[in-house]
Interface confidence: medium
Amino acid sequence: LIIGFGISGRHSITVTTVASAGNIGEDGILSCTFEPDIKLSDIVIQWLKEGVLGLVHEFKEGKDELSEQDEMFRGRTAVFADQVIVGNASLRLKNVQLTDAGTYKCYIITSKGKGNANLEYKTGAFSMPEVNVDYNASSETLRCEAPRWFPQPTVVWASQVDQGANFSEVSNTSFELNSENVTMKVVSVLYNVTINNTYSCMIENDIAKATGDIKVTESEIKRRSHLQLLNSKAS
């Protein structure tokens, strides 16, 4: 969490941002909130990016003002116009690119004063893994697949019964470049699976950590997976 204040204490407002991560090719949110004003026409929101000459986005007098917007953000940004009045200056960024990573500044002017806060925005690719019994194998094996990751993640297997066991000798992980030549498909196979056990396939890079669990019993399997972004720190 980054909380920024105006330069002069008397005319400062609190602005709060949250460091976040964008999944390339998808839409992302750069979070920013501020002390609200009662008049929309008195609120100015400016988003800037370190190293970029033009503005990322500007909103003033109740509407977008994009005459000074930098080319790299053309047609890709929007604020939540109906939520500005309640202090939400978050920016929606469409079709996130690797090059969108960097330090952004959320700069706010209201009738109460000015304030700004920075946020670190990381970009990469992350996706939910699916674990299944690999029915192509001769012995019982598990296959963990996740379609899109970048940078290349690490993959670690764990089991509920054999806690702390190292499965690196009985697993095999491969990374296959996807058609856009940036993200990769992750496939990891675990051999010598025992029944009445729950196995976890954990995929992690510096942006996200995802886990696919599968409970294997004699008669059936049950799976679930979850994903967590690693750098959601508020400022």
């Epitope: 699916e130 299944n132 019994v133 019982e140 004699e218 008669s219 059936e220 049950k222 679930r224």
Partner: antibody, heavy 116, light 106 residues
Amino acid sequence: EVQLVQSGAEVKKPGASVKVSCKASGYTFTNFWIHWVRQAPGQGLEWIGEIDPSDSYTNYNQKFKGRATLTVDTSTSTAYLELSSLRSEDTAVYYCSREITTVDYWGQGTLVTVSS
Amino acid sequence: DIQMTQSPSSLSASVGDRVTITCSATSSISYMHWYQQKPGKAPKGLIYDTSKLAHGVPSRFSGSGSGTDFTLTISSLQPEDFATYYCHQRRSYPFTFGQGTKVEIK
């Protein structure tokens, strides 16, 4: 007595959506996964997906992913199947069933007819 | 996906006959479940975990098999047994059913 009671028959036009409900009673709803299975006229059984009512976690048959949505309302012990972008091949009886143990429980089935 | 092939697709038998239905999976699935379905009704669990009888199912029904090949046997067919039978696997997603075997009166 454990019961799964489904909503009534539906007639829909191609491209529309349908939402089928399955109200559970006689057991603790959040303790057992709910499965959805369909059966086209004169055909066999096809698994659509499953949902854990305790946390709404779902697993889908890839064939239906993106078109089928499984949800639950724990306050009324009801599971729902919503199927969108309907086509004539979706004409079938849709069943909900409770996760199988030594006894299995099924709804009576809901006939969904897709016709222009 | 694991495909399940039942044979025969249909059969005609008389009351008192011994009936055997087989189910073959494209990959090893360890355990099989069997259902009975009568016209206009929901399926009913018959056998679970390959050989265990579901609650209230008569002992004339039995199941066996392992790996990819499984069998459902009705030792002495009764009038109420005329129905369609399905095998089912829950060991690999997506869960799948056999195409069904219809048991008719000869």
